[in-house]
């Protein structure tokens, strides 16, 4: 058993049928010695008397808010949460496996640049009695500071019969140098509590590996005289690291017909313009990627050919 | 990206082209190592990230773009002395900092070159003959060093009398390649920045 925060405790249980559970001793936070009784949650049934209460915690029915009283007055509370270990592996009931980029990915994180700012998000089908708390650091043995905001509900989607809820959090490394070569990964730890169930999820990454630039901005077409060709031009996104000559991007320009089946023409360039053939009803899209370290491509920025 | 690429003109800065070749070569070598050594811990998540140049060179600091010198987090300065002549310096206007930067890059390359050659000698003794260093990568390191053209004491190749532990050597190869790829990215950024200046 360990303390999650003041008066909230997590009991770690080896979770299998007929498991013996864990013996827990609760102590009433009071100078009083006599006439103390204990109850669980809203029940008025007296579980025991005295300054300490010994309980055998086996299942969720044994978890909850234990209260010690004296003469009708509440003296203190202890909330017991359960953390299930199933065959040596901590349970992951609360969050959905996003399966991207690999199985058992519960937290996904992205950064728009090298400033040390990043966003993480996760999915759940649970709509109520749910709280998250996020901590982060650079490295784990001698951790350096990363400050995270509060996790917020950022999207709701309907997936078949289920509603899916997306939560996200923004974090900022306290003293980040965009040009630094990372040798210690960022660690992100999310505590999740649903009713009386506690779970924790972690992710470890280098900022360089989670970079996903914003799409190029000011995408424009300039028709070339007496030709079906057009000059496409664009600019680096505002959110990208500067100077651009150091933090360079490479671009992919795509000409896509109206039908998804039509052949796509693609050109790769390090410049911020390209000459392509504009077909009728087609659209031109451009996306960006770090020129030197191949992390994710940005989303497409698009304009119609007409 | 084996599709049409509009390649930029390397311009007046001869090292840019070599640094791009270097990044391509080390990336290819790392990919080959990951595939060949699939039963070894060779992914970024599994290895310890070690920098053999730590406390010996300070390329990131010496090559910091002017725009980032205002960022206190980037000024984790270390005093290191460097030789300051080199053929990538395009004009006399080149600052002392730029000379320091390029000489730091040269020292990095020299250190990695020695490590890689020592390692290759060990890998050639492996009866499994599982993996060797790409000669193209070693050649590209050499070309960039020649383009930088710094006079520097030659570092003797490390020789070891004891029987090599091939498992450890292969893990060390992965660690070295990951670190060298990261340094190659920095070198490419620096060359691009200097070329644009």
């Amino acid at each position: 058993i360990w303390e999650l925060k003041k008066d909230v405790y997590v009991v770690e249980l080896d979770w299998y049928p007929d498991a013996p559970g864990e013996m827990v001793v609760l102590t009433c936070d009071t100078p009083e010695e006599d006439g103390i009784t204990w109850t669980l949650d809203q029940s008025s049934e007296v579980l025991g008397s005295g300054k300490t209460l010994t309980i055998q915690v086996k299942e969720f029915g044994d978890a909850g808010q234990y209260t010690c009283h004296k003469g009708g007055e509440v003296l203190s509370h202890s909330l017991l949460l359960l953390h299930k270990k199933e065959d040596g592996i901590w349970s992951t009931d609360i969050l959905k496996d996003q399966k991207e980029p690999k199985n058992k990915t519960f937290l996904r994180c992205e950064a728009k640049n090298y400033s040390g700012r990043f966003t993480c998000w996760w999915l759940t089908t649970i709509s109520t009695d749910l709280t998250f708390s996020v901590k982060s650091s650079r490295g784990s043995s001698d951790p350096q500071g990363v400050t995270c905001g509060a996790a917020t509900l950022s999207a709701e989607r309907v997936r078949g019969d289920n509603k899916e809820y997306e939560y996200s959090v923004e974090c900022q490394e306290d003293s980040a140098c965009p040009a630094a070569e990372e040798s210690l990964p960022i660690e992100v730890m999310v505590d999740a509590v649903h009713k009386l169930k506690y779970e924790n999820y972690t992710s470890s990454f280098f900022i360089r590996d989670i970079i996903k630039p914003d799409p190029p901005k000011n995408l424009q077409l300039k028709p070339l005289k007496n030709s079906r060709q057009v000059e496409v031009s664009w600019e680096y996104p505002d959110t990208w690291s500067t100077p651009h000559s150091y933090f360079s991007l490479t671009f992919c320009v795509q000409v896509q017909g109206k039908s998804k089946r039509e052949k796509k023409d693609r050109v790769f360039t390090d410049k911020t313009s390209a000459t392509v053939i504009c077909r009728k009803n087609a659209s031109i899209s451009v996306r960006a990627q770090d020129r030197y370290y191949s992390s994710s491509w940005s989303e497409w920025a698009s304009v119609p050919c007409s | 990206r084996n599709l049409p690429v509009a390649t930029p003109d390397p311009g007046m800065f001869p090292c840019l082209h070599h640094s791009q070749n270097l990044l391509r070569a080390v990336s290819n070598m790392l990919q080959k190592a990951r595939q060949t050594l699939e039963f070894y811990p060779c992914t970024s998540e599994e290895i310890d990230h070690e920098d053999i140049t730590k406390d010996k060179t300070s390329t990131v600091e010496a090559c910091l773009p002017l725009e980032l010198t205002k960022n206190e987090s980037c000024l984790n300065s270390r005093e290191t002395s460097f030789i300051t002549n080199g053929s990538c310096l395009a004009s006399r206007k080149t600052s002392f900092m730029m000379a320091l930067c390029l000489s730091s890059i040269y020292e990095d390359l020299k250190m990695y070159q020695v490590e890689f050659k020592t390692m290759n000698a060990k890998l050639l003794m492996d009866p499994k003959r599982q993996i060797f260093l790409d000669q193209n990568m070693l050649a590209v390191i050499d070309e960039l060093m020649q383009a930088l053209n710094f006079n520097s004491e030659t570092v003797p190749q490390k020789s070891s009398l004891e029987e090599p532990d091939f498992y450890k050597t292969k893990i060390k190869l992965c660690i070295l390649l990951h670190a060298f790829r990261i340094r190659a990215v920095t070198i490419d950024r620096v060359m691009s920045y200097l070329n644009a200046s």
């Epitope: 080896d14 979770w15 299998y16 049928p17 007929d18 498991a19 299942e59 969720f60 270990k85 199933e86 065959d87 040596g88 592996i89 009931d93 690999k102 199985n103 058992k104 089908t125 | 039963f39 811990p41 599994e46």
Partner: antibody, heavy 115, light 112 residues
């Protein structure tokens, strides 16, 4: 006393369906994940499927994906395996088992797929 | 296809020490716990070892388990005639958990 009692096995023709049941008693069935494991005659153990305690997530071996469906009725304390498009290679003793460091197995039920 | 490899058979005379190996990889045994089961003919498997080296109550102390790197082993110190059975190791793969990974199985024969 934890008990898992299986039923529903038998002889079936290729391409036909069969449903296996596993009745649980002696524990809070709705709190625990459950597996199906099979063993072809003279062969080793092969995992077939898993279902979470609340039925929210199901996992299948590639060999049965799209043909077999694991389900549970927590109000009846029963685990099911619906088997469709059965093949000769599905012939095996099928076991249900609890998930956890200490597990309990059903007695097994024989499924024979033969024309 | 089995990812955990066991020898098809091992044998020993009563009182001898018998060991069964179970070889896997970094993503399974290398990063998960190992269990061992004993299966007597015509019966369901019985848990012998969980958590690499833990014995459930009721399992004789002549059975012991261990794990090192990507391999695990089961030792029977002082093998007895009633130990003649099939033995299976079991673990998980970090990418496919909670799918159970079973070993290929080992037939233990007690001679004489």
């Amino acid at each position: 006393q934890v008990q898992l009692v299986q039923s529903g096995g038998g002889v079936v023709q290729p391409g036909r369906s069969l449903r296996l049941s596993c009745a649980a008693s002696g524990f809070t069935f709705s709190s625990y994940g459950m597996h199906w494991v099979r063993q072809a005659p003279g062969k080793g153990l092969e995992w077939v499927a898993f279902i979470r305690y609340d039925g929210s997530n199901k996992y299948y071996a590639d060999s049965v994906k799209g043909r077999f469906t694991i389900s549970r009725d927590n109000s009846k304390n029963t685990l099911y395996l619906q088997m469709k498009s059965l093949r000769a290679e599905d012939t095996a003793v099928y076991y249900c088992k609890t998930h956890g460091s200490h597990d309990n197995w059903g007695q097994g039920t024989m499924v024979t797929v033969s024309s | 296809s089995y990812v955990l490899t066991q020898p098809p058979s091992v044998s020993g005379t009563p009182g001898q020490r018998v060991t069964i190996s179970c070889s896997g990889g970094r993503s399974n045994i290398g990063s998960n716990l190992v269990k061992w089961y004993q299966q007597l003919p015509g019966t369901a498997p019985k848990l012998l070892i969980y958590g690499n080296d833990q014995r459930p109550s009721g399992v004789p102390d002549r059975f012991s388990g261990s794990k090192s790197g990507t391999s695990a082993s089961l030792a029977i110190t002082g093998v007895q005639a009633e130990d003649e059975a099939d033995y299976y190791c079991q673990s998980y793969d970090r990418g496919t958990h909670p799918a159970l990974l079973f070993g290929t199985g080992t037939k233990v024969t007690v001679l004489g």
